[in-house]
Interface confidence: low
């Protein structure tokens, strides 16, 4: 059957492979056609990076289906974890690096459940499936570690119209989170949501727990006036 | 369409700076790679630097090594050539090209510039 | 640093004509090696990358080879819009080098 490989500059090439195939073979394949050591080369279908040893049957890789080339790079890049209580872990990390693998990478280092863990960047919490080209981590990069709550906690917005809404968050999550959670709730943009608690208006790149919200809080949304 | 655009090149006296812009329009340089490559008179193609601006990597020519850096503006979609302790060596045309295989070490240059030239002299 | 020996460094030749150009590389370079034409004042342009593989636009008079560490670029029917400099480049490794170029003139 053919399968495609398509680059990060857009360029396609087509590989006559069998089902039973390994992904080492189809490194092989590439390196045939283009001369890139298999070392240096890393496939990614529907956002997993593929293993070696795999087949393409064993990721449901049919014919004509897509897959995308990225190289390693030579020794990678450091990019460093802070956790909450200050402490700083370096990670030898490369661009293509998907969420799962660095949050992977800080379980072998400090034992940390991957499902425990939130990494955030540049107030975005980071999604698993993304990789840290994705979100423009580049070398020497700082992500910040929060442990995720088992189960999490209520909280409740209030509008102006008396409507209450509750929402399922995390003293992790950061009040652009909790915006996109009102907008999958009730169809509001973030950027015409405002919150407000103890007085205070809320701060995108912030988190929850900077602002002292606990369980069963009451938030006040006040929308933003277009133009306004 | 693809298209690159050099500029900035002109009459310097040695040991002189200059700094070559490389504007990109018809593709992402973040995605891709940039590279300079210099023609001096009547001579041969001679490889200068690259960026990966995707990798955060770059590659000098050891004739050129701590005397020019490159660097991209991926907002502007411009890569530079800042070009220090210039040497009458250094006279070419330089030329920005695109990278077209993907192997970040060294790949073939599909996309072109129509060249800038530099002359060190005194 | 992989060098990259072209030959010839001129030659004449008629249209209609079949044209061969050969480069070594000094190490292996796998089929890493791409072919280029320039014309006086203009910049290069890709004919053949991957040894073999014709770019995109480029006639199919053009064609590349590779045996071991020698790579040919063979224009089977020379055309009047031919006659140009052609160079070789390994794309293998950094730095990427080319070869000296070879001028291909009107008989």
């Known amino acids: 059957m053919q399968i495609f490989v398509k680059t990060l500059t857009g360029k396609t090439i087509t590989l006559e492979v069998e089902p039973s195939d390994t992904i080492e073979n189809v490194k092989a394949k590439i390196q045939d056609k283009e001369g890139i050591p298999p070392d240096q080369q890393r496939l990614i279908f529907a956002g997993k990076q593929l293993e070696d040893g795999r087949t393409l049957s064993d990721y449901n890789i049919q014919k004509e289906s897509t897959l995308h080339l990225v190289l390693r790079l030579r020794g990678g890049m450091q990019i460093f974890v802070k956790t909450l209580t200050g402490k700083t872990i370096t990670l030898e990390v490369e661009p293509s690096d998907t969420i799962e693998n660095v949050k992977a990478k800080i379980q072998d280092k400090e034992g940390i459940p991957p499902d425990q863990q939130r990494l955030i960047f540049a107030g975005k919490q980071l999604e698993d499936g993304r990789t840290l080209s994705d979100y423009n981590i580049q070398k020497e990069s700082t992500l910040h570690l929060v442990l995720r709550l088992r189960g999490g906690m209520q909280i409740f917005v209030k509008t102006l119209t008396g409507k209450t809404i509750t929402l399922e968050v995390e003293p992790s999550d950061t009040i652009e989170n909790v915006k996109a959670k009102i907008q999958d709730k009730e169809g509001i943009p973030p950027d015409q949501q405002r919150l407000i608690f103890a007085g205070k208006q809320l701060e995108d790149g912030r988190t929850l727990s900077d602002y002292n919200i606990q369980k069963e809080s009451t938030l006040h949304l006040v929308l933003r006036l277009r133009g306004g | 369409e693809v298209q690159l655009v050099e500029s900035g090149g002109g009459l310097v006296q040695p040991g002189g700076s200059l700094r070559l812009s490389c504007a990109a329009s018809g593709f992402n340089i973040y995605y891709s790679s940039i590279h300079w490559v210099r023609q001096a008179p009547g001579k041969g193609l001679e490889w200068v630097a690259s960026?990966?601006?995707?990798?955060?990597?770059?590659s000098y020519a050891d004739s050129v090594k701590g005397r020019f850096t490159i660097s991209a503006d991926t907002s502007k979609n411009t890569a530079y050539l800042q070009m220090n302790s210039l040497r009458a060596e250094d006279t070419a045309v330089y030329y920005c090209?695109?990278?077209?295989?993907?192997?970040?070490?060294?790949?073939?240059?599909?996309?072109w510039g129509q060249g800038t030239l530099v002359t060190v002299s005194s | 640093d992989i060098q990259m020996t072209q030959s010839p460094s001129s030659l004449s030749a008629s249209v209609g004509d079949r044209v061969t150009i050969t480069c070594r590389a000094s190490q292996s370079v796998s089929s890493a090696v791409a072919w280029y034409q320039q014309k006086p004042g203009k910049a290069p342009k890709l004919l053949i990358y991957?040894?073999?593989s014709l770019y995109s636009g480029v006639p199919s008079r053009f064609s590349g080879s590779r045996s071991g560490t020698d790579f040919t670029l063979t224009i089977s029917s020379l055309q009047p819009e031919d006659f140009a400099t052609y160079y070789c480049q390994q794309h293998y490794t950094t730095p990427p080098t080319f070869g000296q170029g070879t001028k291909v003139e009107i008989k």
């Open positions: 960026i990966y601006p995707y990798y955060g990597y770059t």
């Open positions: 090209a695109r990278g077209y295989s993907w192997y970040y070490g060294s790949p073939a240059f599909d996309y």
């Open positions: 991957s040894a073999s």
